[in-house]
């Protein structure tokens, strides 16, 4: 029977800069029941606070709701592991909410085959930013990535769309059914999950352009 091993806070994520959650990995438990507590203070403060919500984020997590989340202040936090034989602390972690944003996937993905008379046909893809992200404030620059593949293919073809919310693809295999997905990331955050797939049938008379 030993004191607990050193825990590590390994992940913090925010869907929208208004709330965030951090997760830790326990160290060894020393063969005894171990209690974990996360304490934090904000830059410019000395007063330590305990995690406001150990439930919402699941096991070994701390969730900071709206009233506990500030974009203006860096959070300095650590986890304490305690059993009957003693305690151990994680390294201090510094968190700036701006840099942990992982948005929800983009919405309203629409895919359409366009066949103008005077130009090559193309696949037109359009989507909307996730609802929780307020782009009007200028705090967010969202970048988008599209992936598509024929239904039975193994490899995805990936296109970086930058900040635009629509995209044209010219090179497609006629007669094939394609899966299309889109994801987004803030300029200094994390990629969202891929949106649910949209399927599109490419007509047999679609002229492939290399």
């Amino acid at each position: 029977q030993l004191p607990p091993g050193k825990p590590e806070i390994f992940k913090c994520r925010s869907p929208n800069k208004e709330t965030f959650t951090c997760w830790w990995r326990p160290g060894t438990d020393g063969g005894l029941p171990t209690n974990y507590s996360l304490t934090y203070h904000r830059e410019g403060e000395t007063l330590m606070h305990e995690c406001p919500d150990y439930i919402t984020g699941g096991p070994n997590s701390c969730h900071f709701g709206k009233q506990y989340t500030s974009m203006w202040r860096t959070y300095i936090m650590m986890v304490n592991a305690t059993n009957q034989m003693g305690s151990s602390f994680s390294d201090e972690l510094y968190v700036d909410v701006t840099y942990i944003v992982q948005p929800d996937p983009p919405l309203e993905l629409a895919v359409e085959v366009k066949q103008p008379e005077d130009r090559k046909p193309y696949l037109w893809i359009k989507w909307s930013p996730p609802t929780l992200i307020d782009l009007k404030t200028g705090w967010f620059t969202l970048l988008y990535e599209i992936r598509l593949k024929p239904e039975k293919a193994a490899e995805w073809e990936i296109h970086f769309a930058g900040q635009q919310t629509e995209f044209k693809i010219l090179s497609l295999h006629p007669g094939q059914k394609y899966l299309v997905q889109v994801r987004c990331k803030p300029d200094h955050g994390y990629w969202s999950a891929w949106s649910p797939a949209t399927f599109i049938q490419i007509p047999s008379d679609f002229t492939m352009n290399d």
Partner: antibody, heavy 118, light 112 residues
Framework: EVQLVQSGAEVKKPGSSVKVSCKAS????????IHWVRQAPGQGLEWMGE????????NYNQKFKGRVTITADKSTSTAYMELSSLRSEDTAVYYC???????????WGQGTLVTVSS | DVVMTQTPLSLSVTPGQPASISCRSS???????????LHWYLQKPGQSPQLLIY???NRFSGVPDRFSGSGSGTDFTLKISRVEAEDVGVYFC?????????FGGGTKVEIK
């Protein structure tokens, strides 16, 4: 203890490439961005670019775009910086540095001296 | 790119005396999120840089309280209230509000 251990000094010919490694330990490698910063002899510091090891997403200083490639190998917890088309002005100490969930550098490697000379 | 200008280039200080380093940026360092990402690093002789101050005025873990940072917008200052022998080295200001991140040219602090 967080450590960033870099590869040893290199001497290179103009026009060639160099690849510097930065092995991370003491933390979960995929959690934090790794940055590369260089320092020419007797000069200031110059940020070259950064990588998110979780998905290898990179941002580069446009000054080096096309010449620098930053990569990360999750299996060995190692980040790499490759600089091509070397010239004498690239003679410098190259540092890797790690952020927290922030955009400033809390931990630094010991530096790797790259000398470009014919 | 944002140009960071430090003054003075070098500083010779008597132990126990104060020292002050100025850093000016070519554009405002206030981020669109309201934060100011201006930091100070110290590079001791033969060592890698180390973080002293983050976001203008916040001391990093383990940094003695004789170091303090202040300023806003484009003008910033690092003060050492009582210089000690271990404070010798080159001090750099750095901004990470705008990409690419940039550094000042450095201020060399020596002991008289």
């Amino acid at each position: 203890e967080v450590q960033l251990v870099q590869s040893g000094a290199e001497v290179k010919k103009p026009g060639s490439s160099v690849k510097v490694s930065c092995k991370a330990s003491g933390y979960t490698f995929t959690s934090y961005w790794i940055h590369w910063v260089r320092q020419a002899p007797g000069q200031g510091l110059e940020w070259m670019g950064e990588i998110d090891p979780s998905d290898s997403y990179t941002n580069y200083n446009q000054k080096f775009k096309g010449r620098v490639t930053i990569t990360a190998d999750k299996s060995t917890s190692t980040a790499y910086m490759e600089l091509s088309s070397l010239r004498s002005e690239d003679t410098a100490v190259y540092y890797c540095a790690r952020s927290f969930f922030t955009n400033w550098f809390a931990y630094w490697g010991q530096g790797t001296l790259v000398t470009v000379s014919s | 790119d944002v140009v960071m200008t430090q003054t003075p280039l070098s500083l010779s200080v008597t132990p126990g005396q104060p020292a002050s380093i100025s850093c000016r940026s070519s554009q405002s360092l206030v981020h669109s999120n309201g934060n100011t990402y201006l930091h100070w690093y110290l590079q001791k002789p033969g060592q890698s840089p180390q973080l002293l101050i983050y976001k203008v005025s916040n001391r990093f873990s383990g940094v003695p309280d004789r170091f303090s940072g202040s300023g806003s917008g484009t003008d910033f200052t690092l003060k050492i209230s009582r210089v000690e022998a271990e404070d010798v080295g080159v001090y750099f200001c750095s901004q990470s509000t705008h990409v690419p991140f940039t550094f000042g040219g450095g201020t060399k602090v020596e002991i008289k």
